[in-house]
Interface confidence: low
Amino acid sequence: ASVGLPGDSLHPPKLSTQKDILTILANTTLQITCRGQRDLDWLWPNTPRDSEERVLVTECGDSIFCKTLTVPRVVGNDTGAYKCFYRDTDVSSIVYVYVQDHRSPFIASVSDEHGIVYITENKNKTVVIPCRGSISNLNVSLCARYPEKRFVPDGNRISWDSEKGFTIPSYMISYAGMVFCEAKINDETYQSIMYIVLVVGYRIYDVVLSPPHEIELSAGEKLVLNCTARTELNVGLDFSWQFPSSKHQHKKIVNRDVKSLPGTVAKMFLSTLTIDSVTKSDQGEYTCTAYSGLMTKKNKTFVRVHTKPFIAFGSGMKSLVEATVGSQVRIPVKYLSYPAPDIKWYRNGRPIESNYTMIVGDELTIMEVSERDAGNYTVILTNPISMEKQSHMVSLVVNVPPQIGEKALISPMDSYQYGTMQTLTCTVYANPPLHHIQWYWQLEEACSYRPSQTNPYTCKEWRHVKDFQGGNKIEVTKNQYALIEGKNKTVSTLVIQAAYVSALYKCEAINKAGRGERVISFHVIRGPEITVQPATQPTERESMSLLCTADRNTFENLTWYKLGSQATSVHMGESLTPVCKNLDALWKLNGTVFSNSTNDILIVAFQNASLQDQGNYVCSAQDKKTKKRHCLVKQLVILERMAPMITGNLENQTTTIGETIEVVCPTSGNPTPLITWFKDNETLVEDSGIVLKDGNRNLTIRRVRKEDGGLYTCQACNVLGCARAETLFIIEGVQEKTNLE
């Protein structure tokens, strides 16, 4: 058979035998001559081997490009392919020679010395046991042991070929420890050598590159890439690497097995690629491929080689970040840099350290932003190699959706007396300032009440307060602006001219950051009335009374309750006066009933009021006809006792005779102090020219005379003590003499 490349001008060498297959008997001499167009060489079975001297290759003598191969006393093992070829080419001619030796029909080749057959437990794989024959048409079977089993060619997946050996699906003999071929010639049995069966794995679980993803290096640095393959046991593995640079001299690859951990069912292989000093040409993709004979797995990474360190901010860096109060703020740092920069954050010039509210690093994270977090944040990047720095400032603006101050007051629903004038207010703080505050209303019965929800009132729709038809007459006053707790707040006031209808009022405030609303329950009753005696605001240690007055013809069962702190946890039911539904949960008070011609009056007396007596008091009265309970809530505030204080300055005054002097003594204290005026340490008494008003606070001297000049003292006293302030009145001018004659 001639073998050559298509279109090649070189003709294959010519052999002295015209046949592709030659059959000769053992102990005869094999001689084949080969002629060609250039230098020739011979290859024969089992070359090289110890008995090489048996094979002779000689020049022909009659031609330059001619060689004769001679093998004297051939044996069965000389069976195989004899190849004549042109040196340094693939152009050749081959003849297959069978040496028929009935005493040893199986050929033992060099590679059979070990007699090992490697197989995988793959259903689709076949294995060749290389028991080649010196006779082409033998009846060969395969014996496997232990247990003993014999396989004969079936014309399908099991076959014997004298040139290859015995082919069989590998799983059929995977149980066996050894196999051999057997042939029968003239009732004589011949056996090939024994082959040990080794079951090998092929599965590669994974191939991992370390470092993974992208590796960044400076020119001149050392690159070390580790490729680790995890396989099943009994696997042999080959590694190969693909890399950008064609200059291989500075690359070093070391492959080794890694000791598997005890108890693991995996084997580890490691291939390490090292470049001692990278250059720009080493930049690119590095692929590690692991091959187990049946399976290939690969992984890749990118090696970036920087010729010099650099640093720059990415184009996506923001200069302004707006956030809503309470939200999480993340200000990422986008940079292009090699190596990774040191990142430092500053706020208003001061370095920021990570704590439970702020985390600094590749991004600045503020867990729950508050208004005080607003300001200028500067991030400074430093390249650790070049020490180059870059800075960028981000302004953080914290927006506050409208916050309605009164919303925070958890107080029970107030009831308002029929026909009275009432004022409702919403104090709103928002940043940026409000777009608007709007007031809406709805009839109480048109809304539903679900106390468990954040917004307990659900009204299908809200009507603008301009439309108060069917409701209370309303007037919205012009917004006031006030500095409260250091913040500019907007105060919107709704004046209900006369309380006739039970309703819900809603103030809605909107700004850029969101909206806020407060729903105010306005429950109007014609029922009981609460009064405090005395009418002045009570001070601790004073005696006072709470009076609940109800029409005797309409109401009965007057009872006083105190709404304790436990009432907030009470389930308030569906009513719009939830406090009435939970009287059992309230603290019942003992009162005294008085009656006059039309009313019953239930009095709770406080002989020596204390701050503990403060709170919400509920008067409950039952409608005689309907048996429905009406409840009225009064918030009782007890003022703490305070010694008198003069809260302002008394200025000295200079005036002319006949003018009017006015002076105010500004005082504070609880109980309200008693004010006395002295002139030159003598008590001042009212007369036609001296007038004392507003509880003696205001002193007026009309048509002053020369003798009205002097040192005036204002003295404020209560049970806790006295406070004094002095002022000097200087009267200028000449007193006219009165002619009495």
Partner: antibody, heavy 115, light 108 residues
């Protein structure tokens, strides 16, 4: 009786503009949030925009943000929708509706964007 | 943004039967801000249920709404021929306001 009547729809080329109006009667217009909802042929409802009673605050769907402007004239009891840079996908019946709960709707006006 | 998903897409029932329509929100919605609408061919939608369970003015009591959080249901207790329509759910708890894709109710 509450009535909402839309007008201003029609055929317009892509990139063109159109202004829709909604005349309201039978209720106090200035008390209510008003909105526009659209419905492409054979499709479901899609909210477009809402405006507060005073006109001080507005909301838009992302699909129309920057192209459509909602406004109102409380003295004329009229709601408007100015539609610019119209696209084929804006083709729909545009409804005007009252309140957050959209308790009353107009009969709609058809806007066709086609070349 | 909150997505509203309605099921089934179509419901084919006989007069007198009961119908249950479901609406699921991608995140929790306050029931106060949830409604159901009915739209008949060639007509504008009309409000049926507001606040998840309150019937709008003039809506027959065979229509009822329930649910909270992310799952809401519209129940029509005894179907009548005039109930043939597309029913939409809607939320305005968070902007943008959003509708479900609709459930078509056919009367056999």
């Amino acid at each position: 009786e509450v009535q909402l009547l839309e007008s201003g729809g029609g055929l317009v080329q892509p990139g063109g503009s159109l202004r829709l109006s909604c005349a309201a009667s039978g209720f106090t217009f200035s008390w209510y949030v008003m909105g526009w909802v659209r419905q492409a042929p054979g499709k479901g409802l899609e909210w477009v925009s809402s405006i507060y009673p005073s006109g001080g605050a507005t909301n838009y769907a992302d699909s129309v943000k920057g192209r459509f402007t909602i406004s109102r004239d409380n003295s004329k009891n009229t709601l408007y929708l100015q539609m610019n840079s119209l696209r084929a996908e804006d083709t729909a019946v545009y409804y005007c509706a009252r309140g957050n709960y959209l308790d009353y709707w107009g009969q709609g006006t058809l806007v066709t964007v086609s070349s | 943004d909150i997505q509203m998903t309605q099921s089934p897409g179509t419901l084919s029932l006989s007069p007198g039967e009961g119908a249950t329509l479901s609406c699921r929100a991608s995140q929790s919605v306050s029931s106060n801000y949830f409604g159901w609408y009915q739209q008949k061919p060639g007509q504008a939608p009309r409000l049926l249920i507001y606040g998840a369970s309150s019937r709008a003015t003039g809506i027959p009591d065979r229509f009822s709404g329930s649910g909270s959080g992310t799952d809401f249901t519209l129940t029509i207790s005894r179907l009548e021929p005039e109930d043939s329509a597309v029913y939409y759910c809607q939320q305005f708890d968070s902007s943008p306001l959003s509708f479900g894709g609709g459930t078509k109710v056919e009367i056999k």
